[in-house]
């Protein structure tokens, strides 16, 4: 690329006119703070380009960098361009205006920065200083890019004197940004709402100092915008937080709300969403099934636990055969609900050593204002067996029987078994069961009678033993589900004394 | 300019309360966090509470926890330190200040205002 | 809770002297330290934040420095002006000032 004049400096005076031509052998062109101004362009008979840039009545305001450059880069070995700075010295003209952002100027690290005050005539000594300091700074100054330096967080000017008048620039502001990468946290007051009430989402990031919130949510896509509250959370530097508020939520509020979150200085970004539910009225529902009949342990501990889902928060309450239970003073019912989740709730009723007077019909209520749901079970009071009487006895009629009585819940099992041979029996010999209708020599007679008041079974059996030849070795196995119990007894010949 | 003037002060039996006004201007106030910082006797300067531009959220030093309410008004551009159960540790020069938005060091301060609690 | 301990608690210097004082945090503050000066019966000024950033009108004869737990704050040549009390304030985690400096002139 040639450029005529070629500079690399040119001053040129105010309201005159100026010619500059670019030529290449490829399409040239001339540019002017990033546009092409009006120029003649050209292809000469020996196949070079050039470009005619005419300035006219110039003015300080013409002051500055103009480019030749290929028009059309495409193929060829390099992107050449030509630059060349132009003043025009206007009296009228103090620093040249700067667009808004060139006036806040932004830096995560200490590094080398420039202050862009410039004038329209490089022999005008120009000084930098903090906005509200007469100091001059000593700071080196070029006339075409401005003062160039490490600044400390803070606000300058730049002064000049033009004639007999002191002139100042706008002020520029040198930021230093905490800037790290980003990482976006969000969540609700409540993620379930009824229609009516409010919604209220909170984004918050930590340790950047420029971020830009933006919100996605379902009520934005049907034009219906909410205008975002950011907060600057004061518990450690730059925890910022933007609040989303959605007052009187409708159903069409339901679903994906989405915090986007953008650092413009590494241009570093980071989103996070959450689901919101809108339910036209509270509810209450049970989660698991809890069977109709649930059992607990005399003299041991029980804990019956009810699941269920909620919102509102629901009221929960415990009957016991109608009566309300609450915790006991002391300390043999103990009631508690927990929220394990936003909505999912626990309700236990542990019975401490449990009585056989707890046993009965239980009913756990979950309640507002908008639902109720109840779940009703019998708890039966299992007793462990006791064998509470072995007897023999020799009626007239010449047999001999044992009486075996006791009593459980539920209802005991009764085994009868024998040893005829007492020296090896029952550890080497395995003891016979007895009562078996097929044995003719035994016949055995069970009576089960339900207790009402002590709620639990008394079985009573006996065994008629039709003739006993030597010493026998007679036991009485009783068994439920929580237990077992044995009492043995020896039962001798009519003929021999015990 | 930014301008803070505190109002309220003045002396207080222990256990009595009092209220303390900041009236600002020269900002936006609702896009700044305001603070209360006190000085007693002869003492160094000791932060007592914060409070969020929103208003949404507030902080306190822990012995003034339970006993002082921090809070504004961004229609009057005003803070108030409501001062409950009142004890004769309390007695200082209390001033208003202002957070940075983001990094949190106190900005701007009012001139004190003198809280003397004293049967 | 961060505690600060500030020193000296006063310091005599004469005018063009340089004084130093010193702030030490409880735990690390990473750079998070502000400084005040404080005049009876004026509102308290800022003027140094993050460390060593000097507030806009703070004369270049003070500056600061320090990391982790340990700063100080320097006035290069004292100036009758500069008499007065400073403190120190951490606001890594809420806010904690130091127990301050009487600054006096010899």
């Known amino acids: 690329l040639v450029v005529t004049p070629p500079g690399p400096e040119l001053v040129l005076n105010v309201s005159s006119t100026f010619v500059l031509t670019c030529s290449g052998s490829a399409p040239v062109v001339w540019e002017r703070m990033s546009q092409e101004p009006p120029q003649e362009m050209a292809k000469a008979q020996d196949g070079t380009f050039s470009s005619v840039l005419t300035l006219t009545n110039l003015t300080g305001l013409d002051t500055g960098e103009y480019f030749c450059t290929h028009n059309d880069s495409r193929g060829l070995e390099t992107d050449e361009r030509k630059r060349l700075y132009i003043f025009v010295p206007d009296p009228t003209v103090g620093f040249l205006p700067n667009d808004a952002e060139e006036l806040f100027i932004f830096l995560t690290e200490i590094t080398e920065i420039t202050i862009p005050c410039r004038v329209t005539d490089p022999q005008l000594v120009v000084t930098l200083h903090e906005k509200k300091g007469d100091v001059a700074l000593p700071v080196p100054y070029d006339h075409q890019r401005g003062f160039s330096g490490i600044f400390e967080d803070r606000s300058y000017i730049c002064k000049t004197t033009i004639g007999d008048r002191e002139v100042d620039s706008d002020a520029y502001y040198v930021y230093r940004l905490q800037v790290s990468s980003i990482n976006v946290s969000v969540n609700a007051v409540q993620t379930v709402v009824r229609q009516g009430e409010n919604i209220t989402l909170m984004c918050i990031v930590i340790g950047n100092e420029v971020v830009n919130f933006e919100w996605t949510y379902p009520r934005k896509e049907s034009g219906r915008l909410v205008e975002p509250v950011t907060d600057f959370l004061l518990d450690m530097p730059y925890h910022i937080r933007s609040i989303l508020h959605i007052p009187s939520a409708e159903l069409e509020d339901s679903g994906t709300y989405t915090c986007n979150v953008t650092e413009s200085v590494n241009d570093h970004q980071d989103e996070k969403a959450i689901n919101i539910t809108v339910v036209e009225s509270g509810y209450v529902r049970l989660l698991g099934e809890v069977g109709t009949l649930q059992f607990a342990e005399l003299h041991r501990s029980r804990t019956l636990q009810v699941v269920f889902e909620a919102y509102p928060p629901p009221t929960v309450l415990w009957f016991k055969d109608n009566r309300t239970l609450g915790d006991s003073s002391a300390g043999e019912i103990a009631l508690s609900t927990r929220n394990v989740s936003e909505t999912r709730y626990v309700s236990e009723l542990t019975l401490v050593r449990v009585k056989v007077a707890e046993a009965g019909h239980y009913t756990m209520r979950a309640f507002h204002e908008d639902a109720e749901v109840q779940l009703s079970f019998q708890l039966q009071i299992n007793v462990p067996v006791r064998v509470l009487e072995l007897s023999e006895s020799h009626p007239d009629s010449g047999e001999q029987t044992v009486r075996c009585r006791g009593r459980g819940m539920p209802q005991p099992n009764i085994i009868w078994s024998a040893c005829r041979d007492l020296k090896r029996c029952p550890r080497e010999l395995p003891p016979t069961l007895l009562g078996n209708s097929s044995e003719e020599e035994s016949q055995l007679e069970t009576n089960v009678t339900y207790w009402e008041e002590e709620q639990e079974f008394e079985v009573v059996s006996t065994l008629r033993l039709q003739h006993v030849d030597r010493p026998l070795s007679v036991r009485c196995t009783l068994r439920n589900a929580v237990g077992q119990d044995t009492q043995e007894v020896i039962v001798v010949p009519h003929s021999l004394p015990f | 300019e930014v301008q803070l003037v505190e109002s309220g002060g003045g002396l207080v039996q222990p256990g009595r309360s009092l209220k303390l006004s900041c009236a600002a201007s020269?900002?936006?106030?609702?896009?700044?966090?305001m603070a209360w910082v006190r000085q007693a006797p002869t003492q160094g300067l000791e932060w007592v509470a914060s409070?969020?531009?929103?208003?949404?959220?507030?902080y306190y030093r822990d012995s003034v926890k339970g006993r002082f309410t921090i809070s504004r008004d961004s229609a009057k551009n005003t803070q108030y330190l409501q001062m409950d159960s009142l004890r004769s540790e309390d007695t200082a020069t209390y001033f208003c200040?202002?957070?940075?938005?983001?990094?949190?060091?106190?900005?701007?301060w009012g001139q004190g205002l003198m809280v003397t609690v004293s049967s | 809770d961060i505690q600060m301990t500030q020193s000296p608690p006063s310091l005599s210097a004469s005018l063009g002297e340089k004084v130093t004082i010193t702030c030490q945090a409880s735990q690390s503050i990473k750079n998070y330290i502000a400084w005040y000066q404080l005049k009876p019966g004026t509102a308290p000024r800022l003027l140094m934040r993050?460390?060593?950033t000097l507030e806009s009108g703070t004369p270049s004869r003070f500056s600061g420095s320090g990391s982790g737990r340990d700063y100080s704050f320097s006035i290069s040549n004292v100036e009758s002006e500069d008499i007065a009390s400073y403190y120190c304030v951490q606001y890594a985690n809420l806010y904690t000032f130091g127990g301050g400096t009487k600054l006096e002139l010899k």
């Open positions: 409070i969020t531009n929103s208003g949404g959220n507030t």
């Open positions: 200040a202002r957070h940075t938005p983001g990094a949190n060091y106190f900005d701007y």
């Open positions: 993050y460390t060593s």
């Open positions: 020269g900002f936006t106030f609702s896009n700044y966090g």
